[in-house]
């Protein structure tokens, strides 16, 4: 069910329209649901979820991660800096979400939904941000070559990459959700 169309909304006609913050919150939770479904298929298909050899594949990846300097943690919290980090991070994740598109059999639609919902989330957040100039968009040429490189990996590394992308994206979204609720 797309965000904003669950049974709770239908059953409560007196409910106020969703605020921008509520819409963003709901969108993140919707994407997290999708990630959960994708992780289930990944973990059922291989033993990557219990593997301790993650460092081998992590070297090839430059997945966005929240750090204290990004202004999203309570210590040194800065709403605008944090918002820029969240949007920049999501834009950087897009190439990895593109990589995931051909990685699932039974959850192909779910992978597409995660990708499309993330694009919508970025739009919501861009409306909220004041300092759009500070947001750096990834270079398409660099992304294209990264995608080619990831797709050329052997099967084991591709499985590991899929697992790491899902795990890191989940963590990034959770950190974002936490910070956005403090705004």
């Amino acid at each position: 069910v797309p965000p904003g169309e669950d049974s709770k909304d239908v059953a409560a006609p007196h409910r106020q329209p969703l605020t921008s913050s509520e819409r963003i919150d709901k969108q993140i939770r919707y994407i997290l649901d999708g990630i959960s479904a994708l992780r289930k298929e990944t973990c059922n298909k291989s033993n990557m979820c219990e593997s301790s050899k993650e460092a081998l594949a992590e070297n090839n990846l430059n997945l966005p991660k929240m750090a204290e300097k990004d202004g999203c943690f309570q210590s040194g919290f800065n709403e605008e800096t944090c918002l820029v980090k969240i949007i920049t991070g999501l834009l950087e994740f897009e190439v990895y979400l593109e990589y995931l598109q051909n990685r699932f059999e039974s959850s192909e639609e779910q992978a597409r939904a995660v990708q499309m919902s993330t694009k919508v989330l970025i739009q919501f957040l861009q409306k909220k941000a004041k300092n759009l100039d500070a947001i750096t968009t990834p270079d398409p040429t660099t992304n294209a070559s990264l995608l080619t490189k990831l797709q050329a990996q052997n099967q084991w590394l591709q499985d590991m990459t899929t697992h790491l992308i899902l795990r890191s994206f989940k963590e990034f979204l959770q950190s974002s959700l936490r910070a956005l609720r403090q705004m």
């Epitope: 709770k8 509520e22 919150d25 939770r29 997290l32 959960s36 929240m66 943690f73 309570q74 210590s75 795990r167 989940k170 963590e171 959770q174 950190s175 959700l177 936490r178 609720r181 403090q182």
Partner: antibody, heavy 119, light 106 residues
């Protein structure tokens, strides 16, 4: 099976520093979405949230007690430590540590320690 | 900070009865509301998270509902072990806040 247990002094003199340790098992504090919080309850009164630490070391404190509190974690030892400076008789309470773990960060405490009474 | 107000502060009922208690938030907290039950001398126990989701192992006679600023916890067919104090808690953002509690006597 998830368990948490608080340990520390039962008696503290005014102006002293209280150090409480929460030892846990059955989960990892390096898993995203997981956090450990401290809550206290003076005799016969309501619950009061004190502090919270996340998997990524982000920390939050009760605004009224922030200047007196410090929360830290040792992921390898499966421990969370709370220190509270300048103790006062009004701080007499049962101190609980509790786990929060869900994808959407509802900050619901699904497992609690037995609590330790500090006078 | 978000303030949580519970009502009534105490109530008594008989085994088999049904009761409803309420919790108000001073501002909208979406569905980020949790309910706990505490028996004397024991640690609190999570009953309901996210306003209406029953925690695993909690009997179906418990039901949470509400959103934004108004929430209720309903217990049908009361049992002797349901006595104690019920607390609501906002889980929307920090600082986390608890209500003052509703003491239930069976």
């Amino acid at each position: 099976q998830v368990t948490l247990k608080e340990s520390g002094p039962t008696l503290v003199k005014p102006t002293q520093t209280l150090t409480l340790t929460c030892s846990f098992s059955g989960f990892s504090l390096s898993t995203s979405g997981v956090g450990v919080g401290w809550v206290r309850q003076p005799p016969g009164k309501a619950l009061e949230w004190l502090a919270f630490i996340f998997w990524d070391d982000d920390k939050y404190y009760s605004p009224s007690l922030e200047s007196r509190l410090t929360i830290t974690k040792d992921t390898s030892k499966n421990q969370v430590v709370l220190t509270m400076t300048n103790m006062d008789p009004v701080d007499t309470a049962t101190y609980y540590c509790a786990r929060s773990a869900d994808d959407y960060l509802y900050y619901s405490f699904d497992t609690w320690g037995q609590g330790t009474l500090v006078t | 900070d978000i303030q949580m107000t519970q009502s009534p502060s105490s109530l008594s009922a008989f085994v088999g009865d049904g009761v409803t208690m309420t919790c108000w938030a001073s501002q909208s907290i979406n569905d980020y509301l949790n309910w706990y039950h505490q028996r004397p001398g024991e640690a609190p126990e999570l009953l309901v998270f996210a306003a209406s989701n029953l925690q695993i192992g909690v009997p179906s006679r418990f039901r949470g509902s509400g959103s934004e600023t108004y929430f209720t916890l309903t217990i049908n067919s009361l049992q002797p072990e349901d006595s104690g104090t019920y607390f609501c808690q906002s889980g929307h953002s920090f600082p986390l806040t608890f209500g003052g509690g509703t003491k239930l006597e069976i």
